[in-house]
């Protein structure tokens, strides 16, 4: 019985290969701190396998625990620039549905020009992740300096 | 039919367990910014399961999407040292085959003595990853301060 | 034969879904540099699936290679504070059993207020991971600023 049960759980598509790696498309208008992302092979090395983009924000399609990671580098930045414009802060969170709104990951730049981090977090189908950059400095659009991704880890 | 198909996809070796975690062996000669890595249980907690080392650079053996991560700490470093020697930059990229050469991940130290980041990226069998450290400071060889690794995530 | 062999390897619980994401509970008494962690759905987005907490330290239940990640943010911190209180250092290591004691991951704050990193490392059933924060600054208990987790990757 247990043997047969295992089989039903394990066709390839049920293994939860959901994964996405995005590159920065653009920043929002003045009062919108969100970063807008894009992904797909035509753009280079970014991709979406499972999750989708909804107006530049990442929407989850499969319930589970995900590894969320991000790196953001500020454009034309030195440690002097970064400290002068402090606080510049990046926050990754669930922004919709509103009932599940929460900050998942938050970092300040202080005297650095790059932040990078990652964490495990439960996400549900329909959760939309937003990345808010507050401050007066622009993020770099270089694909090796600024990126955002998720990886499904387990149910 | 689907049931039988799943079985053919799922023997252990086909699950793509390819993974490697490397420690710094040495830096290159003067005009070579590459870091040279080593791995294996005899060296401590580093290992290669799938990928191989080719003259200190990591070569991929299985196509797929990989999580690439790195941490580099500068030796005998303070925030004063780091800012004085700016720009000290680390870049991780595909360096061969030449047709696939690209920078995957780039960070500057600014006033810090450690950089750490990670990203998802598609890699193909035969891709060789190089880690270039530009600047006039030495990377620490302590295994808990400087390391580089990859983990196969999905086809 | 290979077909049957695959089945034996792949019941769900044998896939090694062990994973944990913890939030800071409290710091230790004066001479104890360890951070004490907590996890569970009642606390928010932290969880333990496989590993356990032993007096606030994370104990591993399954042998394998793990991705270990951490982010620690210092409370009420500016780059001036951080540099003034240097060295403030975070180390993640195996603290028991004593025979396996080793530092796995080490970072200093220098002029920053957050450190974040990750690495792959072999861990064995019974290994207890400790996170030591040395210095005179308190870590933030905000769940989006300070967290610690592990993810089983392969046998």
């Amino acid at each position: 019985q247990r043997f047969a049960q295992a089989q039903q759980q394990l066709p390839l598509e049920s293994l939860g290969w959901d994964v996405a790696e995005l590159q920065l498309n653009h920043t929002g208008p003045q009062q919108d701190p969100r970063l807008y992302w894009q992904g797909g092979p035509a753009l280079g090395r970014s991709f979406l396998h499972g999750p989708e983009l909804d107006k530049g924000q990442l929407r989850i399609h499969r319930d589970g625990i995900y590894m969320v990671h991000i790196q953001v580098t500020l454009a034309i930045c030195s440690s002097t620039t970064a400290s002068r414009h402090h606080p510049t802060t990046l926050a990754v969170g669930i922004c919709s549905p509103a009932s599940r709104s929460i900050s998942l990951l938050r970092l300040s730049f202080h005297q650095g020009c790059t932040i990078a981090s990652q964490r495990l977090t439960p996400l549900a189908r329909g959760d939309t992740l937003c990345t808010n950059l507050t401050g007066t400095l622009l993020p770099s659009r270089n694909t090796d300096e600024t990126f955002f991704g998720v990886q499904w880890v387990r149910p | 039919q689907r049931f039988a198909q799943a079985q053919q996809q799922l023997p252990l070796e086909s699950l793509g367990w390819d993974v490697a975690e490397l420690q710094l062996n040495h830096t290159g000669p003067q005009q070579d910014p590459r870091l040279y890595w080593q791995g294996g249980p005899a060296l401590g907690r580093s290992f290669l399961h799938g990928p191989e080392l080719d003259k200190g650079q990591l070569r991929i053996h299985r196509d797929g999407i990989y999580m690439v991560h790195i941490q580099v700490t500068l030796a005998i470093c303070s925030s004063t040292t780091a800012s004085r020697h700016h720009p000290t930059t680390l870049a991780v990229g595909i360096c061969s085959p030449a047709s696939r050469s690209i920078s995957l991940l780039r960070l500057s130290f600014h006033q810090g003595c450690t950089i750490a980041s990670q990203r998802l990226t598609p890699l193909a069998r035969g891709d060789t990853l190089c880690t270039n450290l530009t600047g006039t400071l030495l990377p620490s060889r302590n295994t808990d301060e400087t390391f580089f690794g990859v983990q196969w995530v999905r086809p | 034969q290979r077909f049957a062999q695959a089945q034996q390897q792949l019941p769900l619980e044998s896939l090694g879904w062990d994973v944990a994401e913890l939030q800071l509970n409290h710091t230790g008494p004066q001479q104890d540099p360890r951070l004490y962690w907590q996890g569970g759905p009642a606390l928010g987005r932290s969880f333990l699936h496989g590993p356990e907490l032993d007096k606030g330290q994370l104990r591993i239940h399954r042998d394998g290679i793990y991705m270990v990640h951490i982010q620690v943010t210092l409370a009420i911190c500016s780059s001036t504070t951080a540099s003034r209180h240097h060295p403030t250092t975070l180390a993640v290591g195996i603290c028991s059993p004593a025979s396996r004691s080793i530092s796995l991951l080490r970072l200093s704050f220098h002029q920053g207020c957050t450190i974040a990193s990750q690495r792959l490392t072999p861990l064995a059933r019974g290994d207890t991971l400790c996170t030591n924060l040395t210095g005179t600054l308190l870590p933030s208990r905000n769940t989006d600023e300070t967290f610690f987790g592990v993810q089983w990757v392969r046998p």
Epitope: - | A75, T80, R84, T136, L137, S140, R141 | -
Partner: antibody
Framework: EVQLVQSGAEVKKPGSSVKVSCKAS????????MHWLKQAPGQGLEWMGA????????SYNQNFKGRVTLTADKSTSTAYMELSSLRSEDTAVYYC?????????????WGQGTLVTVSS | DIVMTQSPDSLAVSLGERATINCRAS??????????MHWYQQKPGQPPKLLIY???NLESGVPDRFSGSGSGTDFTLTISSLQAEDVAVYYC?????????FGQGTKLEIK
Amino acid sequence: EVQLVQSGAEVKKPGSSVKVSCKASGDTFPRYNMHWLKQAPGQGLEWMGAIFPGNGETSYNQNFKGRVTLTADKSTSTAYMELSSLRSEDTAVYYCARNSYYDYAWFTYWGQGTLVTVSS
Amino acid sequence: DIVMTQSPDSLAVSLGERATINCRASKSVSSSGYSFMHWYQQKPGQPPKLLIYLASNLESGVPDRFSGSGSGTDFTLTISSLQAEDVAVYYCQHSREFPPTFGQGTKLEIK
């Protein structure tokens, strides 16, 4: 190949000051600390201090008790060492030196040395 | 300050023979997986010349009869087969912290 060329020998009175120059060839001058070392006749080597020409930051050996001042002129790729309140025991050969690739305090390139004689 | 002590103060070795000079630091000069110990050769009227850096790395252009070893506090410079042009004073130096300091020197002569 970097070359460091120092100014010529000096004879000074006790209590006076001396300023020794060190001109570097090549375009890497601002990126490497320039160190100054003292070698008294028949004696060993003593590190005096260093300057990072990129921003003028200095570090000094406490043994010289504030008598040494290091400066640098990026426009001419020249470093200077001034030693004040001279006394007879300051009679020595003074060297400028720097590393070739990594900017740590070991010394690949050396000036030819400048003999400073302090005598009344 | 870290005190560097060389031994012997002077050494006479026959041509073609091995010469060994030792250097002891008053505390460890190892950090970050490196030993910040270096060796120089100085001939009369010349500035010192770097032979070995980071304990065991041969500086470019230095003959491979020179080698360095050691870690922590104890280090050795070895000349495997002494040549006439190797007559000089040899200094060890650390750069683990400021100020960097030198040994008192070892005078190497031909026996």
